[in-house]
C-alpha cells in the first residue's frame, strides 16, 4: 500500500489551532514539478457534507513529502470530509478523514467501520442532545433510512446493513429531522472487496494474517498497518511517537501522538495512534490494553509486561507476541519484511536462525508462494546464528507474493513470512523526442512513457547512423534532463533509442522503439550581392545577383529573395530553388511601392548572410482617369461620348475602355475597347430605344488606369429593339438587357 498518512489534530478548544497534515513516505512524493512524482493534495471535500462557506483554508507545503491545512475560524469549518491524495500513477491513493462536531445532537460510537464483503455492518449513533423527532440516515448525501425517535436503544440509534458489498462503502450520517446537518453523526464505511482473510481477483488468495489490528488490502494482499506498527504482517512495534510504514515519521509536539487521529489508505480508515483512545484520542490505554484505539489486549505470559505502545515486553529467555515462545525454540532472525527483485533474475536470499539445538543447513528451508520448497546451497555458521543462502531459480511474475523461511529443530519450529515483489524492468512505449537540431548535434528529450515498473534509476540513449552496421554509441543520462548528442555528421539520419533501468540487478529493460533524427546541413557562408535590377512593368521586377568565387562545391540549395514594403509593414519572400540561378523575375508586386530588396543563399533550412540591401521604386499602376466625360443621345439607338485626355501621363496611351450598363439593371456591365487612343469621342451604337444608360471609361498604358466619373443618358424613343450596343461599327459580344 502507499505510505500515506493523514493526521488530524483534535485539540478542539480553539478551532484556529486545529490542523490537518498529510505525510507521504513515498520516494519523490509531493515534488509537483518532478515528472516522476505528482504533488500531494489536501482539501476539504464538500460534495457530501456541505458546510457554510468561510474564509479559504491555508495550505502549506513542508518539504517534498508533507502538506498542512490550517485557517479554520469556527467549529463548523471542521465538520465534514477531508481528503489527501498522494502516490504516482496506478498507486495514486486517497486517504479520507471524517470530522464530527463534539457538540452535535448525535455522535458516532465509532467513526470508521471496516468490514468484509458479505458482513453485516452496524453503525451506532449515540444521543448527545435529545430531540423528539425522527432520525434520518443518509448514505453519501442521499436519503437512506428513517427511524422513529422511540427506536433508540440504550440511547443509541442503530443502522444495520446486512450482507454489505463494496458499493455500500461511503459516508453515512444520522441526523434528527429539523436539525442542522452540522449536528449529524458522520461515519465512514469501508467494505473490503473480499470476504474475511481473502484478497485478489476472485478473492482466491489468502491474506498473510495481519497482526496488531492491521487490515489486509483486498487488491494486493499487503497489510495496512495501524499507526505505530510495521513489518509485512505488522508484527513489529515502532518506538513510541513514531509512525509510517517504516516508523520513519515522528508525531509533532511534546506529548507525542496524543490528540491526533491517524487516517491511512483504505481499507484501514482512521484510528488514534498506538497507546491512545477516545473520541479525541486524548485518553491513554487502560492497563492490559495497547495499540491503536487501545483495541488490543496484551495477555502476556511468562512474566511479560504490557506496554501500551508495543504490547508484551518479554523477559530474558522468552519471545513471541504473548512471550509464549522459549528462546530454546528456534527463531528466525532479522528477516526483511519485504524484498524486491527484477523479473528473470536469479537472486540469492539469506535466512538466519538461532536456537538450541543450533540450526544446521538442512533445517532451514525457503517456501515460494506456489508451495515449492527450496533447500539452501550453503550455510554460514557463526557462534550466535546460522545463515542459510538460497539460490533462487529465474524469477517469474507469479513469484510475487508471500515467501516463507522456516526453521525446524528438535526444540520446535519458527517461520517468518516476507513479501517478494517481482518487478518488471521498464520498457519505453514511445521513441525519444527531438527538440532541436544543428549540423553536428541533436538535442533529445529522453523522458517517455513506459510499461513495467519504476522508479527509473538510469536512462541510456543508444544512437548510430541510419542503415549502419557499426556499433551503437551509448550515453547515460539523468532521467529528468534533455540530452545533447554531440560530434555528429551533418545532413545524416540517426537511429535513436531509449533504454530504461530500474534499481537492482537485472533492472535494465529492453530497448524502446527507434526513431529517425536527421542532423541539419552546414550553414551556407557565402554572401551574395545584387548586380542590378530593372522594372519590367508596374508590378514586375527583374533582379540579378552574383556570388564570390571560392574553391570547391557550392554549399547551398537555392536563394531567398526578400522584398520589404516599409509603408505597409509587409515582407514578401521569393524562393529560387536552383543554386546556379543568378536572376529572377518578381511579379505581382504593388505598383507605386518603395521596396527594400536583398538576397541570401540557403542550405536545407539554414540561411546564409544577406546581401547588402537595395532600394527599388516601382512606377504607379496606370494612367489617371479621362477628364470631362459627356454623353449625348443621337437617336433611339445611338449615344455619343466625348472626353478629354488624362493629364500628366507617364507614357503613351495604348487604348481606352468604355463601360456600358443599363441604369438599374442587374446584368453585368459591358466593356468596349476604343483602340484609337488619339480620339476624344466615340459613338456607341445598337442601344435600345427609350432606355437609360450609365457610362464610364478609363485609359490603359502598361496597365489599366483609374475610372472616370459616371455619366447617364437615355436613348430617344419610338425605336425598335436593338441587337445590342456596338462602338462605331464593331459588334458587342452580348446585349445589355439579355
Amino acid at each position: 500500500a502507499v505510505d500515506l498518512t493523514l493526521l488530524a489534530n483534535l485539540r478542539l478548544t480553539d478551532p484556529q489551532r486545529f490542523f490537518l497534515t498529510c505525510v507521504s513516505g513515498e520516494a519523490g512524493a509531493g515534488r509537483g514539478s518532478d515528472a516522476w512524482g505528482p504533488p500531494l493534495l489536501l482539501e476539504k471535500d464538500d460534495r457530501i457534507v456541505r458546510t457554510p462557506p468561510g474564509p479559504p483554508l491555508r495550505l502549506a507545503r513542508n518539504g517534498s513529502h508533507q502538506v498542512t491545512l490550517r485557517g479554520f475560524s469556527k467549529p463548523s469549518d471542521l465538520v465534514g470530509v477531508f481528503s489527501c491524495v498522494g502516490g504516482a500513477g496506478a498507486r495514486r491513493t486517497r486517504v479520507i478523514y471524517v470530522h464530527n462536531s463534539p457538540g452535535a445532537h448525535l455522535l458516532p460510537d465509532k467513526v470508521t467501520h471496516t468490514v468484509n464483503k458479505g458482513d453485516t455492518a452496524v453503525l451506532s449513533a449515540r444521543v448527545h442532545k435529545e430531540k423528539q423527532t425522527d432520525v434520518i440516515w443518509k448514505s453519501n448525501g442521499s436519503y437512506f433510512y428513517t427511524l422513529d425517535w422511540h427506536e433508540a436503544q440504550d440511547g443509541r440509534f442503530l443502522l444495520q446493513l446486512p450482507n454489505v458489498q463494496p458499493p455500500s462503502s461511503g459516508i453515512y450520517s444520522a441526523t434528527y429531522l429539523e436539525a442542522s446537518p452540522l449536528g449529524s453523526a458522520f461515519f465512514r464505511l469501508i467494505v473490503r472487496g473480499c470476504g474475511a482473510g481473502r484478497w485478489g481477483p476472485g478473492c482466491t488468495k489468502e491474506c498473510p494474517g495481519c497482526l496488531h489490528g492491521g487490515v489486509c488490502h483486498d487488491h494486493d494482499g499487503e497489510c495496512v498497518c495501524p499507526p505505530g506498527f510495521t513489518g509485512t504482517r505488522c508484527e513489529q512495534a515502532c518506538r513510541e511517537g513514531r509512525f509510517g510504514q517504516s516508523c520513519q515519521e515522528q508525531c509533532p509536539g511534546i506529548s507525542g501522538c496524543r490528540g491526533l487521529t491517524f487516517c491511512l489508505p483504505d481499507p484501514y480508515g482512521c484510528s488514534c495512534g498506538s497507546g491512545w483512545r477516545g473520541s479525541q484520542c486524548q485518553e491513554a490505554c487502560a492497563p492490559g490494553h495497547f495499540g491503536a484505539d487501545c483495541r488490543l489486549q496484551c495477555q502476556c505470559q511468562n512474566g511479560g509486561t504490557c506496554d501500551r505502545f508495543s504490547g508484551c515486553v518479554c523477559p530474558s529467555g522468552w519471545h513471541g507476541v504473548h512471550c509464549e515462545k522459549s528462546d530454546r525454540i528456534p527463531q528466525i532472525l532479522n528477516m526483511a519484511s519485504e524484498l524486491e527483485f527484477n523479473l528473470e533474475t536469479m537472486p540469492r536470499i539469506n535466512c538466519a536462525a538461532a536456537g538450541n539445538p543450533f540450526p544446521v543447513r538442512g533445517s532451514i528451508e525457503l517456501r515460494k508462494p506456489d508451495g515449492t520448497v527450496l533447500l539452501s546451497t550453503k550455510a554460514i555458521v557463526e557462534p550466535e546464528k546460522t545463515t542459510a543462502e538460497f539460490e533462487v531459480p529465474r524469477l517469474v511474475l507469479a513469484d510475487s507474493g508471500f515467501w516463507e523461511c522456516r526453521v525446524s529443530t528438535s526444540g520446535g519450529q519458527d517461520s517468518r513470512r516476507f513479501k517478494v515483489n517481482v518487478k518488471v524492468p521498464p520498457v519505453p512505449l514511445a521513441a525519444p523526442r527531438l527538440l532541436t537540431k544543428q549540423s553536428r548535434q541533436l538535442v533529445v528529450s529522453p523522458l517517455v512513457s513506459f510499461s513495467g515498473d519504476g522508479p527509473i534509476s538510469t536512462v541510456r540513449l543508444h544512437y548510430r547512423p541510419q542503415d549502419s552496421t557499426m556499433d551503437w554509441s551509448t550515453i547515460v543520462v539523468d532521467p529528468s534532463e534533455n540530452v545533447t548528442l554531440m560530434n555528429l555528421r551533418p545532413k545524416t539520419g540517426y537511429s535513436v533509442r531509449v533504454q530504461l533501468s530500474r534499481p537492482g540487478e537485472g533492472g535494465e529493460g529492453a530497448w524502446g522503439p527507434p526513431t529517425l533524427m536527421t542532423t541539419d546541413c552546414p550553414e551556407p557562408l557565402l554572401q551574395p550581392w545584387l548586380e542590378g535590377w530593372h522594372v519590367e512593368g508596374t508590378d514586375r521586377l527583374r533582379v540579378s545577383w552574383s556570388l564570390p568565387l571560392v574553391p570547391g562545391p557550392l554549399v547551398g540549395d537555392g536563394f531567398l529573395l526578400r522584398l520589404w514594403d516599409g509603408t505597409r509593414g509587409q515582407e514578401r519572400r521569393e524562393n529560387v530553388s536552383s543554386p546556379q540561378a543568378r536572376t529572377a523575375l518578381l511579379t505581382g508586386l504593388t505598383p507605386g511601392t518603395h521596396y527594400q530588396l536583398d538576397v541570401q543563399l540557403y542550405h536545407c533550412t539554414l540561411l546564409g548572410p544577406a546581401s547588402p540591401p537595395a532600394h527599388v521604386l516601382l512606377p504607379p499602376s496606370g494612367p489617371p482617369a479621362p477628364r470631362h466625360l459627356h454623353a449625348q443621345a443621337l437617336s433611339d439607338s445611338e449615344i455619343q461620348l466625348t472626353w478629354k485626355h488624362p493629364e500628366a501621363l507617364p507614357g503613351p496611351i495604348s487604348k481606352y475602355v468604355v463601360e456600358v450598363q443599363v441604369a438599374g439593371g442587374a446584368g453585368d456591365p459591358l466593356w468596349i475597347d476604343v483602340d484609337r487612343p488619339e480620339e476624344t469621342s466615340t459613338i456607341i451604337r445598337g442601344l435600345n430605344a427609350s432606355t437609360r444608360y450609365l457610362f464610364r471609361m478609363r485609359a490603359s498604358i502598361q496597365g489599366l488606369g483609374d475610372w472616370s466619373n459616371t455619366v447617364e443618358e437615355s436613348t430617344l424613343g419610338n425605336g425598335l429593339q436593338a441587337e445590342g450596343p456596338v462602338q462605331e461599327s464593331r459588334a458587342a459580344e452580348e446585349g445589355l438587357d439579355q
Epitope: Q132, D134, I136, S142, Y143, T146, E151, L177
Partner: antibody, heavy 119, light 109 residues
Framework: EVQLLESGGGLVQPGGSLRLSCAAS????????MHWVRQAPGKGLEWVSR????????YYADSVKGRFTISRDNSKNTLYLQMNSLRAEDTAVYYC????????????WGQGTTVTVSS | QYELTQPASVSGSPGQSITISCTGT?????????VSWYQQHPGKAPQLLIY???YRPSGVSNRFSGSKSGNTASLTISGLQADDEADYYC?????????FGTGTKVTVL
C-alpha cells in the same frame, strides 16, 4: 418507475372487516416511512396511519385507533391496513403514500381503492 | 381530531396570482417546518406541490411557492392557468400524527 398500487377495497357491512394492500415497486420499499390517507366522498383528505421502515413503530388517527392496524412486509414490498369494526363513516377512497425521504411530504401516492361500509 | 383551516374557495383570472392560507396552532403549523401542499384534480390522487414549507419537488412549476408566518402557512400560485383549477390541501405534523387542511377549491375564471 416508482409506483404504489392499492387493492382490497369493496363493499362491507357495518361491523365487518377488510384488509387493504399496497404493492410498492421502483424503489427500496424497506427504507421508507409509509402512510394511509383516506377521502370520504365529496370531502377532504384525512390522515389515517403511518408506519416506520422497521415496522416497529406505528401511529394512528384518533378516529381509527383500536380498530385499524397498519403493517408491512418488506420482503414482499407490501403495505397493509387491517380494518375491523367498520362503520359507515369509514366509507372513503383509501390511498397509500410514501414519505419523501428526509421530509414529511408524501411524494408518491397510489391511485386509491374504494371502501364502502353499508348495510 | 381537528383539521387545519383553509378558505373553502379562491378564484382568479388567467395570469393573475392567488394565495391560499392554512391556519393552525403553535403545536402544528407554528412549531413544524414540515408543512406540505398537495394538488388534487377531480377523480385523481393528490400530488405533492410543496414540501418543508417552501421547497418544490423536481417537475413542479416555479409558479407555485410556499411560505410560513407564525401559525399560518401560505401557497401562492402566480400566472394562473386553466390547468390550475383543482382542490388544494395543506398538511402539517404534530408529535405523533399528520394533519390535513380542510381543502380549498381553486376556480380559474
Amino acid at each position: 418507475e416508482v409506483q404504489l398500487l392499492e387493492s382490497g377495497g369493496g363493499l362491507v357491512q357495518p361491523g365487518g372487516s377488510l384488509r387493504l394492500s399496497c404493492a410498492a415497486s421502483g424503489f427500496t420499499f424497506s427504507r421508507y416511512v409509509m402512510h394511509w390517507v383516506r377521502q370520504a366522498p365529496g370531502k377532504g383528505l384525512e390522515w389515517v396511519s403511518r408506519i416506520y421502515p422497521s415496522g416497529g413503530w406505528t401511529y394512528y388517527a384518533d378516529s381509527v385507533k383500536g380498530r385499524f392496524t397498519i403493517s408491512r412486509d418488506n420482503s414482499k414490498n407490501t403495505l397493509y391496513l387491517q380494518m375491523n369494526s367498520l362503520r359507515a363513516e369509514d366509507t372513503a377512497v383509501y390511498y397509500c403514500a410514501r414519505v419523501a425521504g428526509e421530509s414529511n411530504g408524501m411524494d408518491v401516492w397510489g391511485q386509491g381503492t374504494t371502501v364502502t361500509v353499508s348495510s | 381530531q381537528y383539521e387545519l383551516t383553509q378558505p373553502a374557495s379562491v378564484s382568479g383570472s388567467p395570469g393573475q396570482s392567488i394565495t391560499i392560507s392554512c391556519t393552525g396552532t403553535s403545536s402544528d403549523v407554528g412549531g413544524c417546518n414540515y408543512v406540505s401542499w398537495y394538488q388534487q384534480h377531480p377523480g385523481k390522487a393528490p400530488q405533492l406541490l410543496i414540501y418543508d414549507v417552501s421547497y418544490r419537488p423536481s417537475g413542479v412549476s416555479n409558479r407555485f411557492s410556499g411560505s410560513k408566518s407564525g401559525n399560518t402557512a401560505s401557497l401562492t400560485i402566480s400566472g394562473l392557468q386553466a390547468d390550475d383549477e383543482a382542490d388544494y390541501y395543506c398538511s402539517s405534523c404534530t408529535s405523533s400524527s399528520t394533519l390535513f387542511g380542510t381543502g380549498t377549491k381553486v376556480t380559474v375564471l
